[in-house]
């Protein structure tokens, strides 16, 4: 397969899932750069900023589904993650503009990074699936960054409205990825304990 | 067991063009990022830049921009340092790296590729 | 770019005594927002690529014995080798991961007295 092997060490694989996770909540990896690249850095708008109720599964829920349906809504949710950050890449400012701005070409890269960091996560996702013997989850996508966008999820032609929209969305997802560390946290020594 | 298995040592003359590799094993090659690090006789570490198999997504230290090319193959798990023109100052150990997610810490290393570019 | 420096560059201690190397930033690598210190530490035997020792200024990798130890916040870090054993001699560096391109340290040698 593309993706190359998969480790058969439940221990190893969880701890990288969990350091995987512990880096990508926090936002000054990808909330801090998208506000200040699109110029939400101002504390009136930011508190605009919050995230949508239901765009995100809770903790409360996560900890209640079991490890193959925890497992499952994170890949079906990161799915969704990544069509929402190449839409919100489409419409970020080309570095040159960014340069002419005095805005930093580091924040643009961090946003850049984001989708091969979910990807890659979303892989250990597939791999712990795997070992958890879970037959009902799919290979992630192979597919990089040449592919078809998807259309933006929420159509406006209000520029602020969507900047407002990604911002929001993002707030959600870095809170989302605290949630999912804290239940891999709780995840036992061995594979075969509480499973559902 | 995770394993990063680099390309022999190489000996090239100036002007050369040379394509090291490093072959990941014992995890999914397509999980994590990989880092280029340089070592020059009795130097420090100087990090080159960093790709992300699964896409080709690709980052270079400015230091190293234009001076080489980091590419990779996910078919067979394998990342790639090259050089179109060696110069004698590229004369150093070369250490591919396992990044969890970019930027961070670096959690696996090859065992080194040394290069010597001599007359 | 970051610039990292340590000191001292080497230094000589007896075995079972304790070594202590710093690294100073050149701006804060402490993220507010979460309290974390976007540090690491590596330990390079002779002959061998580097190892990761301490990732987050003070979260001590799978494996790394308990005698090292690693410290600070903002743009000063310590890592502390609580009883050196014979096996420790090696150079050591510290490396932000605040932001790319990513620095190291330019290295402490630590060698038995």
């Known amino acids: 397969a593309a993706m190359g092997s998969c480790s058969k060490e439940y221990r190893m694989l969880l701890g990288q899932l969990q350091k995987q996770t512990d880096l990508m909540q926090d936002t000054s990896r990808l909330l801090d750069p998208y506000i200040r690249i699109q110029g939400l850095d101002i504390p009136k708008l930011r508190e605009h900023c919050r995230e949508s109720p239901g765009a995100f599964p809770s903790e409360e829920t996560l900890r209640g589904l079991g490890r193959r349906g925890f497992l499952q809504t994170l890949n079906a949710t990161l799915g969704r993650v990544l069509h929402r950050l190449a839409d919100l890449e489409q419409h970020l400012p080309k570095a040159q503009d960014l340069e002419r701005s005095g805005l930093n070409i580091e924040d643009l890269e961090k946003l850049q990074m984001a989708r091969p960091n979910v990807l890659g996560l979303r892989n250990n996702i597939y791999c712990m699936a795997q070992l958890l013997d879970n037959s009902d989850m799919t290979e992630p996508t192979k597919a990089g960054r040449g592919t078809p966008q998807p259309p933006t999820p929420t159509p406006t032609s209000d520029v602020f409205q969507r900047k407002l929209e990604g911002c929001s969305f993002l707030r959600g997802y870095h809170r989302f990825m605290h949630s999912v560390g804290r239940v891999f946290s709780k995840w036992g020594e061995s594979p075969n304990r509480s499973r559902r | 067991e995770v394993q990063l298995v680099q390309s022999g040592a190489e000996v090239k003359k100036p002007g050369e063009s040379l394509k090291i590799s490093c072959k990941g094993s014992?995890?999914?090659?397509?999980?994590?990022?990989i880092s280029w690090v340089r070592q020059m006789p009795g130097k420090g570490l100087e990090w080159m830049g960093i790709?992300?198999?699964?896409?080709?997504?690709?980052r270079y230290s400015p230091s190293f921009q234009g001076q080489v090319t980091i590419s990779a193959d996910k078919s067979i798990s394998t990342a790639y340092l090259q050089w179109s023109s060696l110069k004698a100052s590229d004369t150093a150990m070369y250490y591919c790296?396992?990044?969890?997610?970019?930027?961070?810490?670096?959690?696996?290393w090859g065992q080194g590729t040394l290069v010597t570019v001599s007359s | 770019d970051i610039v990292m420096t340590q000191s001292p560059d080497s230094l000589a201690v007896s075995l079972g005594e304790r070594a202590t190397i710093n690294c100073k930033s050149s701006q804060s690598v402490l993220y507010s927002s979460n309290n974390k210190n976007y540090l690491a530490w590596y330990q390079q035997k002779p002959g061998q690529p580097p190892k990761l020792l301490i990732y987050w200024a003070s979260t001590r990798e799978s494996g790394v014995p308990d005698r090292f130890s690693g410290s600070g916040s903002g743009t000063d870090f310590t890592l502390t080798i609580s009883s050196l054993q014979a096996e420790d001699v090696a150079v050591y560096y510290c490396?932000?991961?605040?932001?790319?391109?990513?620095?190291f340290g330019q290295g402490t040698k630590v060698e038995i007295k």
């Open positions: 790709i992300y198999p699964g896409d080709s997504y690709t």
């Open positions: 490396q932000q991961y605040y932001s790319t391109p990513l620095t």
């Open positions: 014992g995890y999914s090659f397509t999980s994590y990022w």
């Open positions: 790296a396992r990044v969890p997610v970019s930027p961070a810490y670096l959690d696996y």
